[in-house]
Amino acid sequence: TPEVWVQVQMEATELSSFTVHCGFLGPGSISLVTVSWGGPDGAGGTKLAVLHPELGTRQWAPARQARWETQSSISLALEDSGASSPFANTTFCCKFASFPEGSWESCGSLPPSSDPGLSAPPTPVPILRAD
């Protein structure tokens, strides 16, 4: 069964900077990736980035840069412009559309006790969904 993993990481040098890393574990070719925050795609989440393997990548504030890390993983850099840190308690969700498997989504967030530079563990379950 395909799996999606999500890691949320606070940058050690920039406490207002976060990076979301997501990957797809499974066969098939990825046709589109969407990264949302505040909940899963279509369930209250707001899309922050859309990545297509050949057409390009798009992101919207507070996302700074979306990029493919490998053929099956992506990263999204976020800049927290506010004085407080809303990202610390936010859920980020990554949805991978692949052929012929369909869509798979998983969510993750920064653990409350995270030290800068440490990552949240991969969280492929409880919001793993196949459309």
Partner: antibody, heavy 114, light 113 residues
Framework: EVQLQQSGPEVVKPGASVRISCKAS????????INWVKQSHGKSLEWIGD????????NYNQKFKGKATLTVDKSSGTAFMGLRSLTSEDSAVYYC???????WGQGTTLTVSS | DIVMTQSPSSLNVSAGEKVTMSCKSS????????????LAWYQQKPGQPPKLLIY???TRESGVPDRFTGSGSGTDFILTISSVQAEDLALYYC?????????FGGGTKLEIK
Amino acid sequence: EVQLQQSGPEVVKPGASVRISCKASGNTFTDFFINWVKQSHGKSLEWIGDVNPDSNGANYNQKFKGKATLTVDKSSGTAFMGLRSLTSEDSAVYYCATLFFDNWGQGTTLTVSS
Amino acid sequence: DIVMTQSPSSLNVSAGEKVTMSCKSSQSLLNSGNQKNYLAWYQQKPGQPPKLLIYGASTRESGVPDRFTGSGSGTDFILTISSVQAEDLALYYCQNAHSSPYTFGGGTKLEIK
């Protein structure tokens, strides 16, 4: 297949503002993320910016910051581009296109003339 | 901003001929992570909006005839039409799909003798 229907031609006076619309009817969410592109007469294409219907957030080409304002009404699937302080340099055909430019509207001709 | 330079600015060919047009970018359009080139080609016929022909430098959009072929990597790209047809009369633009602002080349005008 997605259809992008743009509003009709506009003739406006210098200094005025205008708002162009682009209604998307599609079946995937990417059909509602809209780019705007300018094509001056006999010239190439210039990307103005794009708008995200989830957040109403927009990305702009620095050249068009302060000139264009991009918004979207998610409920109706309509994107809007406002252009302010118009001059003859703004006379052009303006296109809307889907997120990765795979579908385009028919274009809206803007003429700025006194 | 990434500058896209197309050449030649115009081509005048007979039906059935093979044509090539060039597009050069001022920065690499290759994404090192997935080894894909974010370069697109568009065809614009008179009085019509542009139409996506090729993306990822070499992938034909659905419905595009196989006489259209995209090639190249990094900063140098080519669009080839293997056997030009009368209906190919159009302007052809390349576009940087790699990074904002998504700049277009100046275009190559294809005219049929």
